[in-house]
């Protein structure tokens, strides 16, 4: 139809034949005329979106081919245009195809299979192998453009389709199209680093790998040094791959080949997509030389009861990792290295714990236990003073020539010796007797041994038959020794002496 315009206004060009659509048989001549005093050019956009130009007002295409199907536009110098759509009908080529098919999740995707013959029926989309299309897939056919798949789903990824139509009752199919779906971004990227802190010596190589995961390749990522303002780090190696559909992974490897002390700081791996951003930080500390720092031990003086177990535990930080650990008992090297383990599973861990288990300790095993640890750059030590608490043991209980009764006991802590007298009728000795003399002797070579206490009483104070009890006690327990007396006239005789250990 001829375009119309108001009098006095520039009018669009006229096209002959004066219709909006034209059907030409393939092999025939296509002839179009543009009528306009200010004619400028004819343009034709191919299926591949190529622009073909003709500056003659007549467009003549001898032996027209199906690929010449499309919109022909005539323009004038006023910028006004008129168009006609031409179908070049080819029995051997019903569909114009050749472009791949991509679609974005939640958007529409155009299957480019325009028809060369509008006089066909049931223009539609089918699955390549004759199976049913997904039940939720809807499409809208347009003979001049192709078939639009509405609201593409991720599940349609790799779906193989053909365009189809019926000509004279016969179904015709296009070549295959395999839909590639690009995921819609509905979440921020996932960003991770294996270590959140790193400790290095000057000159060591610092390497940290940041892993970025997202549904598509359009994620942006980078390493930044917080200085404290973020500075982009350019010397980063990138690796990336698809772990599967909609599972894209990228690795950004930051390397500082010879770390300096002033390289210390916070490094941020940053990633963003159209939904938002995510980041993770890792801290680098570069030290001039290695070190060992032993954490303060709450109590280096340890008291343990005879026969019991005790753990001597040392926590320390070391970098580089400790090379030698050793326990020394009373300044003599022990074969026992203790049990050494790292404080956490962190790969860059510098915190260690060493535990020496002393089992069923004897009274003779008290003393100094020293833990020594060293690495290539430093060494450190800590000493425990272990005291073994032992129940008093009465070593001797004698009647001396001078009439004294003497009791000697050992134990740790220092035993207290108490004396009691009781008559034969009493079940228990409860009458206290004051000692005449008390002496503490340290017979041990070291200050950690048992303490010996000697106590004496004067037997002449006793006027009746009975029993004298020497009782040695400390925090651990008590032991007793008994002296039995009988009077024969004026003579007092020690009849019997025996000990009784009270648990």
């Amino acid at each position: 139809s001829q375009p119309s315009a108001s009098p006095g206004e520039p009018s669009p060009p006229s096209i002959h034949p004066a219709q909006s659509e034209l059907i030409v048989e393939a092999g025939d001549t296509l002839s179009l005329t543009c009528i306009d005093p200010d004619f400028v050019r004819w343009t034709f956009k191919t299926y591949f979106n190529e622009m073909v130009e003709n500056k003659k007002n007549e467009w003549i295409q001898e032996k027209a081919e199906a690929t010449r199907t499309g919109t022909y536009t005539c323009s004038n110098s006023n910028g006004l245009t008129s168009s006609i759509y031409v179908f070049v009908r080819d029995p051997a080529k019903l569909f114009l195809v050749g472009l791949p098919l991509f679609g974005k999740e939640d958007s529409d995707a155009l299957v480019r299979c325009p028809l060369t013959d509008p006089q066909v029926s049931n223009y539609s989309l089918i699955e390549c192998d004759g199976k049913s299309l997904p039940t939720d897939l809807t499409f809208v056919p347009n003979p001049k453009a192709g078939i639009t798949i509405k609201n593409v789903k991720r599940a349609y990824h790799r779906l193989c389709v053909r365009c189809a139509a019926q000509r004279d009752g016969t179904w015709l199919h296009s070549d295959k199209f395999t839909l590639k779906v690009r995921a819609a971004i509905k979440a921020i990227p996932v960003v991770s680093v294996p270590e959140t802190s790193h400790l290095l010596k000057k000159g060591d190589t610092f390497t940290v790998v940041c892993t970025i995961k997202d549904v598509s390749t359009s994620v942006n990522s980078m390493w930044l040094k917080m200085n404290p303002q973020p500075q982009h780090i350019a010397q980063v190696k990138h690796n990336s791959w698809h772990r599967g559909d909609f599972n894209y992974e990228r690795q950004e490897t930051l390397t500082i080949s010879s770390a300096r002390v002033d390289d210390s700081g916070v490094f941020m791996c940053y990633a963003n997509n159209t939904f938002g951003s995510a980041n993770v930080t890792t801290t680098l500390k570069v030290v001039e030389k290695g070190f060992i720092n032993i954490s303060p031990v709450k109590n280096t003086t340890v008291f343990v009861t005879d026969g019991e177990n005790v753990d001597l535990v040392v926590e320390y930080e070391a970098y580089p990792k400790p090379e030698h650990q050793q326990w020394i008992y009373m300044n003599r090297t022990s074969a026992n290295k203790g049990k050494d383990y790292v404080k956490s599973d962190n790969k860059s861990n510098i915190r260690y714990v060493n535990q020496l288990r002393l089992t069923r300790l004897k009274g003779t095993e008290g003393g100094t236990y020293t833990f020594l640890v060293s690495n290539s750059d430093a060494s450190a030590s800590v000493t425990f003073n272990v005291y073994v608490n032992t129940k008093p043991e009465i070593l001797t209980y004698d009647r001396l020539i001078n009439g004294m009764l003497q009791c000697v006991a050992e134990g740790f802590p220092e035993p207290t010796i108490d004396w009691y007298f009781c008559t034969g009728a009493e079940q228990r000795c409860t009458t206290p007797v004051s000692p005449v003399d008390v002496q503490v002797q340290n017979v041990s070579v070291s200050p950690f041994g048992k303490l010996v206490v000697q106590s004496s009483i004067d037997s002449s104070v006793f006027r009746h038959n009975g029993t004298v009890e020497c009782k040695a006690s400390n925090d651990v327990g008590k032991s007793s020794a008994f002296f039995n007396f009988a009077f024969k006239g004026n003579n007092k005789e020690q009849i019997q002496a025996h000990t009784l250990f009270t648990p």
Partner: nanobody, 119 residues
Framework: EVQLLESGGGLVQPGGSLRLSCAAS????????MGWVRQAPGKGLEWVSI????????YYADSVKGRFTISRDNSKNTLYLQMNSLRAEDTAVYYC????????????WGQGTLVTVSS
């Protein structure tokens, strides 16, 4: 103004290799999908390959799959097509083109570079 300039075409024997390059300017290359299209003498246009903006997703027409490799260097704004095991039927003018993902078509083209495979 979008400009795409192809280079690297020439005469090569069957079984040989060629590497085409395409220098891009006038747009933000690193965020655009790109591709190669070819036109054999007397024939219509045929898409060859497409690559996504980061250079990870690559797609090939069945006729070149396993022989051609598309790649890109976003720092140099350059697209490449490595062509191995060339055949006589690969003879064509090869065009570098910007692929519009949303409309499923190429929206800008280069002038093309001729590749002739002949003994």
């Amino acid at each position: 103004e979008v400009q795409l300039l192809e280079s690297g075409g020439g005469l090569v024997q069957p079984g040989g290799s060629l590497r085409l390059s395409c220098a891009a300017s006038g747009f933000t290359f690193k965020v655009e999908d790109m591709g190669w299209v070819r036109q054999a003498p007397g024939k219509g246009l045929e898409w060859v390959s497409i690559i996504d903006s980061p250079g990870i997703g690559t797609y090939y027409a069945d006729s070149v799959k396993g022989r051609f490799t598309i790649s890109r260097d976003n720092s140099k704004n350059t697209l490449y097509l490595q062509m191995n095991s060339l055949r006589a039927e690969d003879t064509a003018v090869y065009y570098c083109a910007k692929w519009n993902f949303d409309s499923n078509q190429f929206d800008y083209w280069g002038q093309g570079t001729l590749v002739t495979v002949s003994s």
